[in-house]
């Protein structure tokens, strides 16, 4: 199904305009900002979501130490260029002709340059580390129950195949979710780890992208899990190229 047939909406992306003008009068939805037709049975690519967002009106530890090449999205929001499949174009430029190269999740991976800057290929982000801090609770969550709950969430809510959730680490109050997905592992139809991480981040911030679904209500054996801080690290298949340590 492309979209909810009964009332013609997109369950997986509320930043769309839908109408029954698809083949055979079927509901078809297009992303705001780009007008690209989206598949409402799966997550929409982060590039199209970011474009839609920019077009909308403004208003001895078990924890993983991020690799020295890990990127954090410090640049914030920008209006991206997406390819016809909705992926980020390798080179992004702003209105003042400042350009830079990005990875598959749209995070800058080079110094900024001018229009002569070349970005030969879109480098894949194959490892994402989601670092969360939960609000104080009476006691620590059971690690196994927390682990299973987060794996279930990524399967059920984001449709991410279980093989791509590499690990869940917990050292109260810090939770780390590791997502891994090499180019060779990703089959047609598989949700991209970058898209799953983006939907999760928006859910955690109370800015759910889903249409007509309640916000994220995370519970571990009935105990609410409330996230108070999120930091996401991105590791690319090829290390980033910056002229100096950031």
């Amino acid at each position: 199904h492309t979209a909810a047939q009964d009332n013609c909406t997109c369950p997986t992306n509320k930043m769309t305009v839908c109408s029954p003008d698809g083949p055979g009068g079927r509901c078809q939805c297009r992303a705001l900002g780009s007008g690209v037709a989206v598949d409402c049975s799966t997550l929409t690519s982060e590039c199209l979501l970011l474009k839609a967002r920019m077009s909308a009106p403004k208003n001895a530890r078990t924890l993983v130490r991020p690799n020295e090449h890990a990127l954090v999205d410090n640049d914030g929001l920008y209006d991206p260029d997406c390819d016809p499949e909705g992926r980020f174009k390798a080179r992004q430029c702003n209105q003042t002709s400042v350009c830079w190269c990005v990875n598959s999740v749209g995070v800058r991976r080079t110094d900024k340059g001018d229009l002569s800057l070349r970005c030969d290929e879109l480098v894949r982000t194959h490892h994402i580390l989601i670092d969360l801090r939960h609000r104080p609770t009476a006691g620590a969550f059971n690690h196994s129950d927390l682990d299973a709950e987060l794996r279930r969430l990524f399967r059920e809510r984001y449709r991410l195949h279980p093989k791509f959730v590499a690990a869940v680490h917990y050292e109260q109050p810090t939770i780390q979710i590791e997502l891994r997905q090499n180019t060779s592992q990703k089959a047609a139809g598989d949700v991209d780890i970058g898209d799953a991480a983006y939907y999760f981040e928006r859910d955690v911030k109370g800015e759910s992208l889903f249409q007509g679904r309640g916000g994220l209500d995370l519970r571990v054996r009935g105990e609410p899990l409330q996230v108070e801080r999120t930091l996401i690290y991105y590791l690319d298949e090829i290390p980033p190229k910056f002229s100096m340590k950031r």
Epitope: Q5, D147, A148, R151, R155, E156, P162, K163
Partner: antibody, heavy 117, light 106 residues
């Protein structure tokens, strides 16, 4: 072809334990989840829990916690479910089922466990 | 736990009839799944994500609904459709099933 082949029927006495096996083929074992569901005679389906085969992460329902143990042997692509302190109410057909981005997409043929003195 | 209540519990119908089975959840769920089970056999996935037919399932089956109310419809009953049908949710642990609807020949 995806297949889940379960072990044969078992008859056990109250208080004993039973271990049901589920041998998988036709897919990469460690990429998936195996869930366990039971069905008492003439009754509906009841979920017991699941094991993530790649990480060994397990979730048991509250009702079975403490009495059930789920394991997996990746070398033989076999998942196991052991239920201890058996009582007559545990008489049921026990199913294993594969999970992916669906809760259960392929099912084993079922194993009848009879608990009788 | 999310309770799922199916209605009716049993149903007698004839070949060619249109049949509707409902599943009501005690709290909102994202999607509903439907399974068909024949005597002595394992359940078979029929519908996933509320309305998408599983591979090989005939188009006479359809699913709809949202929130707490979901429906399975068989537009024109065939002899092989007489079976027991279960709804199931996995929006939260533990996964739960409806009590089942037994569809019998009138």
């Amino acid at each position: 072809e995806v297949q889940l082949v379960q072990s044969g029927p078992e008859v056990k006495k109250p208080g004993a334990s039973v271990k049901v096996s589920c041998k998988a083929s036709g897919f990469t074992f460690t990429d998936y989840v195996i869930g366990w569901v039971r069905q008492a005679p003439g009754q509906g389906l009841e979920w017991i829990g699941e094991i993530y085969l790649g990480s060994g992460t397990i979730y048991y329902t509250e009702k079975f916690k403490g009495r059930v143990t789920m394991t997996a042997d990746t070398s033989t692509s076999t998942a196991y479910m052991e239920l201890s302190s058996l009582r007559s109410e545990d008489t049921a057909v026990y199913y294993c089922a594969r999970g992916s981005i669906f809760p259960f997409d392929y099912w084993g043929q079922g194993t009848l466990v009879t608990v009788s003195s | 736990d999310i309770q799922l209540t199916q209605s009716p519990s049993s149903l007698s119908a004839s070949v060619g009839d249109r049949v509707t089975i409902t599943c009501s959840a005690s709290s909102s769920v994202s999607y509903m799944y439907w399974y068909q089970q024949k005597p002595g056999k394992a359940p078979k996935l029929l519908i996933y994500d509320t309305s998408t037919l599983a591979s090989g399932v005939p188009s006479r089956f359809s699913g709809s609904g949202s929130g707490t109310d979901f429906t399975l419809t068989i537009s024109s009953l065939q002899p092989e459709d007489f079976a027991t049908y279960y709804c199931q949710q996995w929006s939260s642990y533990p996964y739960t099933f409806g009590q089942g609807t037994k569809l019998e020949i009138k």
